[in-house]
Interface confidence: low
């Protein structure tokens, strides 16, 4: 059988070559009939056996931490037969470690992040080393862990590599911190070897800073012409924190006139003054207003830092401006009837000027040929006023102060031309009507109806009669239906187209006004030669045909 | 040696969501940083963004409002995902390494894929 | 962003005269970190130099980089025809990483 011991070959060995050990058959009696060979990976360039005595030798440096073992297979052949004198085995080549690897920390560069003015304790981060070497030989991969610079706000527990906090540290005095850790192999004994590393402590922000005013006392203006909204200037606080922790809120907090507000500019964290209600510089010209600010998130922990929000003090200057002449009324509303003289009274408008100085104040109506304003206001006819031709007027009056001219106010006023009974009634279209000559007594020949331009206060009311003449020539009679039209009928059986063709009836048409006016309209009726049912169609055509130049047979 | 091949779909509608796989061969997606540019049709090299093996991402800002890269360590792959596409996005995208190891700054990168083209269109 | 401008647009020589092609940066590329690409037609781009003059394992020494701060520099000392082809600059030196337009290099 096979002989031999466990093989190791120390890693690092300097010398050109290194006996191994010794491969041996127990059949061999030393007479050198046996050839012994190697094979495998290494067989050949790192082991070299003498074929003869089976010595292995190791011919290169080996290094234990890019290979650790090389597993090779043995052969013993007997020369004078060329039979194998043992069957083929295999056999491990050990490379045993020496302490040649410095601790390394791989996933640098570390970086941590930690809350300011965390307590003593607190965990930072773990780092941790890597030695290559064999953790099962001897102290070769076991490591202590040591602070080289952080002191005194950091420690590192010499076994896991857990950097902790041990004094509290001021964000806004210094806000990250370079601290280098070492890792020694060897539990730290003589001729260990180490390795370092840098960990950036950032210390992240927390609100332990409240927003203070710049300034105690801010002046500023506004016009007393300003909008309400209007941004009339800007108060700034700082605040040593930052990012979120440094957000702040402005708010009023005294103002009895109630007229301004303070809004948040959140990009530029100042507070913006605005006016809430328009501001008269005539009424009062100054304001004291006082504001503070707080920050937008504060954790309730940290409300110790808060306790008192910071002031400041605004004064308001109201500016004056020359404001236009100002009307009592926004709009005025005036009646006057129709057909009044020239000259006529219609109403008065007043403006005064708002300001200190009271200017006197100039009217004028803008493109009015109809009616008048004089200084006083007193708006007067310049012509009669017809209802029925324009109901209503739409003025433009303006104001404008004598002292600065332009300083110009203007407001509607609207004018309602009252109405008087100064139109009668009359037909509402022309009526040209037909008769046959066989026609009976009674027969309907048309129906009228009236119209009237004046205005009514309630329901117009018409009254038809036929006139004083046409009521004793009785051919005609007339009813009125009591609803503003009415009939005219035959008053006789048969009508003779060639004596008398066409008759001109006088109708009269009253209102029910006061006075009562009375129109004479005149209907003109055609008699025609109609057929037996008695349609006065065939004589409508016949007139049209005439009036058109033609003959009928 | 190390090898990259991008799969994906060629063609994807407008407004819909592009998605493209970039998958590791020949070596380990641990310790290196991975990054997918794009190259319009006869145009230049857009980066588009990393991911670390970690899970870490780092996106161009002129897409990270429609970005999303991710990593599947088990399969040694990592993922890009372009909402809302448009024509413009069509392109050659291209998956590649940073040639420095473990953490640290950016790097060239010494290792491509060959490239997917995809197409945006209805 | 760092916006690398290159120049020129098109380069139009012949096998064996020497290439100089320029990379502009907008602002100072920290750390020299510049790297040059070159691309094939139907080619991925391959890494040339990185770090604005180490060259990446494998490329021919007639290629060489220089330069600093925003002007950077791809020589190719005696043209080949195999390196006709388009190249491109890239900072990644600050984020987001960032390539020029690119320099057509075209036989006369």
């Known amino acids: 059988g096979w002989v031999w011991n466990q093989f190791f070959v120390p890693e690092e060995m300097n010398t050109t070559s290194h006996h191994v050990g010794r491969l041996r058959s127990d059949l061999d009696n030393g007479n050198n009939s046996f050839q012994y060979k190697l094979l495998g990976a290494g067989a050949g360039s790192t082991f070299i056996i003498d074929e003869r005595t089976g010595d292995i030798y190791a011919i290169e440096k080996l290094d234990r931490e890019e290979r650790s073992l090389y597993i090779l297979r043995a052969q013993v052949i007997d020369i004078t037969t060329g039979r194998a004198v043992e069957p083929e085995s295999e056999f491990v080549i050990k490379v045993s470690d020496i302490n040649d690897n410095e601790p390394k920390f791989l996933d640098e560069p570390y970086e941590a992040i930690v809350p300011e003015m965390s307590p003593e304790g607190t965990l930072v981060i773990q780092v941790t080393a890597s030695d290559a070497d064999d953790p099962s030989s001897g102290n070769n991969a076991r490591l202590l862990y040591s602070l080289l610079q952080g002191q005194p706000y950091f420690s590192v527990e010499p076994t896991t590599g857990v950097i902790r906090i041990s004094s509290k540290m001021d964000r806004e005095l210094q806000d990250e911190y370079w601290v280098i850790i070492q890792a020694k192999d060897m539990i730290g004994q003589p001729g260990a070897l180490s390795g370092t590393t840098s960990v950036l402590i950032k210390l992240s922000d927390v609100n332990d800073n409240k927003p203070i005013f710049k300034e105690s006392l801010y002046r500023l203006t506004v016009s007393e012409s300003a909008p309400t909204g209007t941004s009339i200037g800007t108060i700034m606080a700082y605040d040593n924190d930052i990012g979120e922790n440094a957000e702040m809120d402005y708010s009023i907090e005294e103002d009895d006139s109630q007229t301004f507000d303070i809004i948040t500019n959140h990009e530029t964290q100042e507070g913006i003054v605005i006016l809430k209600k328009k501001v008269n510089f005539e009424h009062q010209n100054h304001y004291g207003i006082r504001a503070k600010v707080k920050n937008h998130h504060v954790d309730k922990q940290l409300m110790k830092y808060h306790t008192e929000a910071s002031t400041t003090f605004i004064k308001i200057q109201v500016e004056d401006v020359d404001e236009p002449p100002l009307f009592l009324l926004p709009y005025y509303i005036f009646e006057i009837f129709e057909e009044t003289p020239q000259g006529s009274f219609v109403g008065v408008v007043s403006a005064t000027d708002p300001d200190n100085r009271k200017s006197p104040i100039r009217y004028s109506i803008t493109r009015s040929k109809v009616f008048n304003i004089d200084d006083n206001g007193t708006i007067t006819t310049t012509n009669s006023l017809d209802r029925e031709i324009s109901a209503w007027y739409n003025l433009s009056i303006t104001a404008t102060e004598k002292y600065n001219i332009e300083q110009i106010s203007s407001i509607p006023v609207y004018v309602q031309v009252l109405n008087i009974n100064d139109h009668a009634p009359e037909f509402s279209q022309y009526y040209e009507s037909y008769v046959c000559e066989n026609a009976g007594s009674g027969q309907v020949i048309q129906t009228i109806s009236a119209v009237d331009r004046d205005e009514s206060i309630e329901e117009h009311h018409f009254y038809f009669n036929l006139s004083v003449e046409d009521t004793n020539s009785s051919s005609f009679t007339i009813i009125d239906n009591q609803d503003n039209t009415a009939v005219i009928l035959t008053n006789r059986t048969g009508f003779n187209l060639q004596e008398e063709p066409i008759f001109y009836i006088s109708i009269l048409i009253a209102d029910n006004g006061i006075p009562s006016l009375t129109s004479t309209n005149t209907l003109t009726i055609h008699v025609c030669d109609c057929d037996d049912s008695g349609s006065t169609q065939t004589c409508q055509y016949q007139e049209l045909m005439l009036s058109m130049g033609f003959k009928t047979e | 040696q190390v090898q990259l091949q991008e799969s994906g779909p060629g063609l994807v509608k407008p407004s819909e969501t592009l998605s493209l796989t970039c998958t590791v061969s020949?070596?380990?997606?641990?310790?290196?940083?991975w990054s997918w540019i794009r190259q319009p049709p006869g145009k230049g090299l857009e980066w588009i963004g990393y991911?670390?093996?970690?899970?870490?991402?780092n996106y161009n800002p002129s897409l990270k409002s429609r970005v999303t890269i991710s990593v599947d360590t088990s399969k040694n792959q990592f993922s890009l995902k372009l909402s809302s596409v448009t024509a413009a996005d069509t392109a050659l995208y291209y998956c590649?390494?940073?040639?420095?190891?473990?953490?640290?700054?950016?790097?060239?990168?010494?290792?491509w894929g060959q490239g997917t083209m995809v197409t945006v269109s209805s | 962003d760092i916006v690398l401008t290159q120049s020129p647009g098109t380069l139009s020589l012949s096998p064996g005269e020497r290439a100089t092609l320029s990379c502009r940066a907008s602002?100072?590329?920290?750390?020299?970190?510049l790297a040059w690409y070159q691309q094939k037609p139907g080619q991925a781009p391959r890494l040339l130099i990185s770090g604005a003059s180490s060259r990446a394992t494998g490329i021919p020494d007639r290629f060489s980089g220089s330069g600093s701060g925003t002007d950077f520099t791809l020589t190719i000392s005696r043209l080949e025809p195999e390196d006709f082809a388009v190249y491109y600059c890239q900072q990644y030196g600050k984020s987001p990483i960032t390539f020029g337009q690119g320099t057509r290099l075209e036989m006369k």
């Open positions: 602002q100072s590329v920290a750390g020299s970190y």
């Open positions: 991911i670390y093996y970690i899970g870490s991402t």
């Open positions: 590649a390494r940073d040639s420095r190891y473990r953490s640290g700054w950016y790097d060239a990168f010494d290792i």
């Open positions: 020949g070596g380990s997606i641990n310790s290196y940083y």
